[in-house]
Interface confidence: low
């Protein structure tokens, strides 16, 4: 996270780290004791296998991640249209062998409902242990931000994206840059209080560099997603 | 605005994944056309930010809020694992309907053993002129002590 | 730069309604990152905390001043308002409104300069 | 409600000290706490949030650590214009409360 602040403890308690060989890749969020929605793109070919993966939940700092509750994975579902190139559908869901124990540090956020407005520039906040700026290491604490939603005709814009977003994509971040997701954030959320919940509304999936003017950055489109979500959780539960 | 487009006629239903459109009155018809066959496990949902429990009726080729009537919490954990929270059930209660709804899903009680949707049909009165809303999961909440808010 | 300002009455009668606004400007009252409170301060004693608001309406008030109190927000005049009724000499205080970050870092971070309400006959 | 109580209820100091005022939760908070300046007839003004976190413009001799129950706000060389009283909030559970503050005088 480009220009964020470090979480306190219990502030994003969704957020889950995926780590590959003892490595952080990838965010995840929880959405069940048993299921974790990170991004298609993370579980590409060759890491499209359960067994690389675990997920570690409730702890704050990747170097004290093994302190902290540590699933392995059972199964990885990428989203049966995710496309590599474009980045479309960049969605996918991770079954846990044991399932989570909820406490002040591990909950799940809630997935969106139809019929849900947002807001022209809907506050919203990324989360994760990416980059603090482009082309830096992950970060060792887990850091978050605030980003206003872009409504897509507006990121479609010559000036922006010039047509790269699709419905199944939603742009979040500040026109003039400063504050955006990078890279090692993928696969973590972008959620939005409302009612005074927190809901689900994006997996963190691409941009053009982090923190870049008029390069704000994407995410999967989680409400576009509920229906195969809730799909895949009634077929391999 | 909605972060919402969908491929299909007004008429018609989506089928997902598969992105495959279907007349809206074979929906929830009980006969699988989608696919993966989500137009027969895709007939409850919950809706909007206050999570009412809606039905989709194939008759009438829309959802609806499922009346407070009769309503236990038995059948809202019946609804969750519908939905796909097979472990999974927070709360089930009524709410006011704020919607102005004029038309209902309601339970009919004496339908016997039968599939929750089955028990169900379309009505123009609820009097309780409550919805029922289910929360399958205790979701986006920060701290076990914020949620007395 | 977001400012709050508090207006309102300085006497209020005994048993009559406290009633008070507070406008906010350089910034949107309908924004889900804050919650606006109203926190009060006798004379020569400390600081409590009698409610908040969120642009959606939903509200918060401490328990004893529950049943007296009322915070409502208008939207369309970028302001949001205290109601107390049936007040006595005891809820004569410098009331000060003030934006309550909501998600995670919390603390009162902007305030309004206070306004004195005395309640006297 | 939670109350919290701040230790001393005065302090008398010179410019230069090291001042150190505590808050005690009467239950566990995490990191939900946040501290303020109020001088004579102004407004109350953020120093620290999220317990130990300097709110942007702060000088940085104020600093807050703690974490649970026990919390601590140290002035590391007092200045005259940090004369002033000090108030603790919780925001974990509402009511939110404040202490009942700690007025640091000149010796």
């Known amino acids: 996270i480009v220009g964020g602040l470090n979480a306190s403890p219990g502030d994003w308690p969704w957020q889950v780290s995926l780590h590959v060989q003892g490595v952080h890749v990838c965010g995840g969020s929880i959405i069940t004791p048993e299921w974790i929605v990170t991004a298609a793109h993370c579980v590409e070919e060759p890491l499209s296998s359960p067994r690389y993966w675990t997920a570690f939940a409730g702890i704050l700092r990747q170097s004290l991640m093994f302190y902290g509750s540590r699933h392995q994975v059972e199964k990885v579902i990428s989203h049966p249209n995710y496309d590599s190139k474009t980045k479309n559908n960049d969605i996918a869901l991770m079954k846990l062998q044991t399932p989570l124990a909820f406490n002040d540090l591990v909950k799940p956020v809630c997935l969106p409902n139809p019929g849900m407005m947002l807001d022209l520039d809907q506050e919203c906040w990324i989360s994760g242990w990416g980059a603090t700026y482009e082309k830096g290491k992950t970060s060792d604490v887990l850091n978050a931000a605030m980003v206003p939603l872009i409504e897509p005709s507006k990121c479609n814009s010559k000036y922006i994206y010039n047509n790269l977003i699709t419905p199944a994509m939603i742009c979040a971040g500040f026109l003039q840059g400063s504050v955006d997701s990078c890279q090692g954030d993928s696969g973590g959320p972008l959620v939005t209080l409302k009612n005074g919940i927190w809901w689900l509304i994006g997996d963190t999936s691409w941009g053009s560099g982090c923190a870049k003017a008029l390069r704000p950055g994407v995410y999967g489109n989680v409400t576009v997603f509920t229906d195969w979500i809730y799909q895949q959780m009634r077929a391999n539960s | 605005w909605r972060f919402w487009d969908s491929n299909c006629s007004t008429s018609e239903m989506e089928c997902g994944s598969s992105g495959t459109c279907i007349s809206s009155s074979l929906w929830c018809d009980g006969v699988a056309h989608c696919p993966n066959g989500e137009d027969e496990n895709r007939c409850v949902r919950l809706y909007g930010q206050s999570f009412i429990l809606q039905v989709y009726s194939s008759q009438r080729k829309a959802w609806y809020p499922v009346c407070q009537d009769d309503w236990s919490e038995s059948y809202g954990r019946a609804a969750c694992k519908d939905m796909g929270y097979k472990n999974n059930f927070y709360s089930s209660q009524g709410i006011p309907d704020q919607s102005g709804a004029t038309s209902f899903m309601k339970l009919n009680v004496s339908s016997g053993n039968v599939d929750l949707y089955k028990k169900l049909y379309h009505s123009d009165s609820c009097s309780s002129r409550m919805v029922v809303s289910l929360r399958c999961i205790e979701c986006g909440v920060r701290s076990v002590k914020r949620q007395s808010r | 730069q977001l400012q709050l300002q508090e207006s309102g009455p300085g006497l209020v009668k005994p048993s009559e309604t406290l009633s008070l606004t507070c406008t906010v400007s350089g910034g949107s009252i309908n924004s889900n990152s804050y919650y606006w409170g109203w926190i009060r301060q006798p004379p020569g004693k400390g600081l409590e905390w009698i409610g908040s608001?969120?642009?959606?309406?939903?509200?918060y008030y401490t328990p004893s001043l529950k049943s007296r109190v009322t915070i409502s927000v208008d939207t369309s005049k970028n302001q949001f308002s205290l109601k107390l009724t049936s007040v006595t000499a005891a809820d004569t205080a410098v009331y000060y409104c003030a934006r309550e970050q909501v998600p995670g870092y919390y603390g009162m971070d902007v305030w309004g300069q206070g306004t004195t309400v005395t309640v006297s006959s | 409600d939670i109350q919290l109580t701040q230790s001393p209820s005065f302090l008398s100091a010179s410019v230069g000290d090291r001042v150190t005022i505590t808050c005690w939760a009467s239950q566990g908070i995490s990191r939900y706490l946040a501290w303020y300046q109020q001088k004579p007839g102004k407004t109350p003004k953020l120093l620290i949030y999220?317990?130990?976190t300097l709110q942007s413009g702060v000088p940085s001799r104020f600093s807050g650590t703690g974490s649970g129950t026990d919390f601590t706000l140290t002035i590391s060389n007092l200045q005259p214009e940090d004369f002033a009283t000090y108030y603790c909030q919780q925001f974990d559970s509402y009511p939110w409360t404040f202490g009942q503050g700690t007025k640091v005088e000149i010796k």
């Open positions: 608001i969120y642009y959606d309406r939903n509200t």
């Open positions: 999220a317990a130990s």
